[in-house]
């Protein structure tokens, strides 16, 4: 039998993440991740991490928090690297096709690996009480751990849709798993969800050459409200569109626009045009680098930060032991597992409705002939 | 800071070859897709090519002009981006920048958009 | 493939003078990028999917538009402004952009 994943989440990044508690083999798991269509998870640093983090720390898989877990990802020895005690992996590396990243900003080593040039060493993320991430431990490719993490790469993904009346939101993304929330889903997501009067909806993330929508969607709301509000997407009455500081903390619903007092909701064009052509007051708190995404309605445009990338795995054509998992983004029956990540959106969001990109480089060029950064 | 730097470029005779290249950095190249496009001298923007990233397959697109004489390539290893030019005609004569295609999020939607332009490199094809 | 016609072709404006572009698409299409040169530079996307500005573009500018007629608005002309605007669909291949429109100051 081969679990479900227990957790995952996807990032605007593009970058989605599964957490797996399945006793097994480094090489199983590697398996495991190519059949669902990703490969064993790099945790290199910055976004990644705390992604990473925040699926551990959702919650602790079987034993209930009561041991420490050992999960396989794509961190390894090989067989003619030595041990370098100076180097924040200790010559382990990321088995991935990113070309350099800073591996300064990572995880402490919970025993230091043991001395050698010649063996090929894996590398094991440990968890404390299965859900608090101590650091890396080196162990034996051959020996099983608790579980592993695998990632997938995606070039565009569906933003969350907004409620509005739904209730009973369920979120089926491709390879097996189910939530009640998620920022960012990937091609072939389905959502379905109960308008008012129980009836039924269900919408599908499609990808195409614009980019990527939920098919079936009016609007960006599930199910329109009855009203003229909306508060963190989900359908609000006047009296609760106040914030702590007495601010405007709505937007307006589908045929609303805000009215000149600023705090009112007034069909489209008796009030005054709002930014970006939408209702939204300039309250609006931004989509932040570190906090998460509000309901999105200004835009955000997604810049990754550098080490952040897809692993490209060496497929090994002898795996005959794992059943077929369907791959993300097939056309496959879909079954449960929970779910739960907040995206970051490495955007700041400009009282303009524009964005100022948020970007870590580490690297430049003195050359003239370069991108020219200003122009978005 | 995204930068893409574009070189290759040259004179060229007709029915001559030529590979143009694009070192990119500053972003997770492997995981956006990328064009080239090109722009004749005092004349409008012209689409060349795509070649999207590893997650689709590396799939590649292009223009009716330039199909079978043209091939878009990459490699991720090296954050690097290739347009193979053969059978150059005097009507490829141009600049050819190397793009970036973004993602851009807004309402419930996600929207490619070129956003990152490089300075381009100039092809000129003359006998 | 889709055929993108910008008018006018080339068109001068005066400091805090409304401007309005246009492209008209042979077949309809989903959405409409556009992008802003000057001379001797690279392009730089200034509207995308119909109407929301890149960053750093003036909140002056504007973006609507569907079918196949679309249009970039100035609501008052600055110095700056002045460069060619192409517009561009990817809602089919091959990908088009329009010819141009080059503003002026007058």
């Known amino acids: 039998e081969h679990p479900t994943a227990d957790r995952a989440g996807c990032s605007a990044s593009g970058a989605c993440y599964s957490l797996h508690h399945a006793t097994m083999k480094r090489q199983a798991a590697e398996e495991a991740c190519i059949l669902r269509g990703g490969a064993l998870s790099t945790v290199r640093a910055g976004a990644e991490l705390r992604a990473v983090l925040a699926l551990l720390r959702a919650g602790p898989g079987p034993g209930g928090g009561s041991k420490d877990l050992l999960f396989w990802v794509a961190l390894e020895r090989r067989r003619s690297h030595c041990t370098l005690e100076n180097e924040p992996l200790r010559g382990f590396s990321w088995l991935s096709s990113d070309p350099g990243g800073l591996e300064s900003d990572t995880l402490q080593w919970v025993e230091e690996p043991q001395r050698s040039c010649t063996a090929r060493r894996c590398a094991v993320l440990q968890a404390t009480g299965g859900v608090e991430p101590a650091g890396w431990k080196e162990m034996r490719c051959h020996l099983r751990a608790n579980g592993y993490l695998c990632k997938y790469q995606f070039e565009v993904l569906c933003p969350a849709p907004r409620p509005g009346a739904a209730s009973n939101l369920s979120y089926r993304a491709p390879f097996q798993l189910h939530s009640a929330a998620l920022d960012f889903s990937p091609p072939g997501t389905e959502v379905s969800a109960l308008c008012r009067g129980q009836l039924p909806i269900s919408v599908t993330c499609i990808a195409d050459e614009i980019g990527a929508r939920w098919d079936k969607l009016s609007g960006d709301v599930l199910c329109p409200c009855p009203g003229r509000y909306l508060r963190a997407g989900k359908c609000a009455e006047l009296p609760n569109c106040l914030d702590d500081l007495g601010g405007f903390a709505c937007e307006c619903a589908t045929g609303f626009e805000l009215g000149k007092d600023g705090r009112s909701c007034v069909t489209s064009g008796e009030g005054q045009p709002t930014l970006g052509g939408t209702g939204v007051p300039t309250r609006r708190p931004p989509a932040t680098a570190t906090s998460p995404v509000p309901q999105r309605t200004w835009p955000i445009r997604v810049d990754e930060k550098l080490g952040e990338t897809p692993l490209v795995p060496e497929q090994d054509n002898s795996v005959t032991s794992i059943p077929e998992i369907p791959r993300w983004g097939s056309q496959s029956t879909m079954s449960t597992l929970q779910m739960s990540l907040q995206a970051e959106s490495k955007a700041t969001i400009t009282p303009s409705g524009s964005v100022i990109s948020k970007f870590n480089s580490t690297t430049s060029s003195a050359t003239p002939q370069a991108f020219d950064s200003s122009s978005a | 800071e995204v930068q893409g730097v574009e070189s290759g470029g040259g004179l060229v005779q007709p029915k001559g070859s030529l590979k143009l290249s694009c070192a990119a950095s500053?972003?997770?190249?492997?995981?956006?897709?990328m064009h080239w496009v090109c722009q004749a001298p005092g004349k409008g923007l012209e689409w060349v090519a795509r070649?999207?990233?590893?997650?689709?397959?590396?799939?590649?697109y292009y223009a009716d002009s330039v199909k079978d004489r043209f091939t878009i390539s990459r490699d991720d290893s090296q954050s690097m981006l290739y347009l193979q030019m053969n059978n150059l005609k005097t009507e490829d004569t141009a600049m050819y920048y190397c793009?970036?295609?973004?993602?851009?999020?807004?309402?419930?939607?996600?929207?490619?958009?070129?956003?990152?332009w490089g300075q381009g490199t100039s092809v000129t094809v003359s006998s | 493939e889709i055929v993108l016609t910008q008018s006018p072709a080339i068109m001068s404006a005066s400091p805090g003078e409304k401007v309005t572009i246009t492209c008209s698409a042979s077949s309809s299409v989903s959405y409409m990028h556009w992008f802003q040169q000057k001379p001797g530079t690279s392009p730089k996307l200034w509207i995308y999917?119909?109407?929301n500005l890149a960053s750093g573009v003036p909140a002056r500018f504007s973006g609507s538009g569907s079918g196949t007629s679309y249009s970039l608005t100035i609501s008052r002309m600055e110095a700056e402004d002045a460069a060619t605007y192409y517009c561009?669909?990817?809602?089919?291949?091959?990908?088009?952009f329009g010819a141009g429109t080059k503003l002026e100051l007058k």
């Open positions: 793009v970036r295609e973004g993602v851009y999020y807004y309402g419930s939607s996600g929207y490619y958009a070129m956003d990152y």
């Open positions: 999917s119909t109407s």
């Open positions: 070649i999207r990233s590893k997650s689709n397959n590396y799939a590649t």
């Open positions: 500053g972003f997770t190249f492997n995981t956006y897709a």
């Open positions: 561009q669909q990817r809602s089919s291949y091959p990908l088009t």
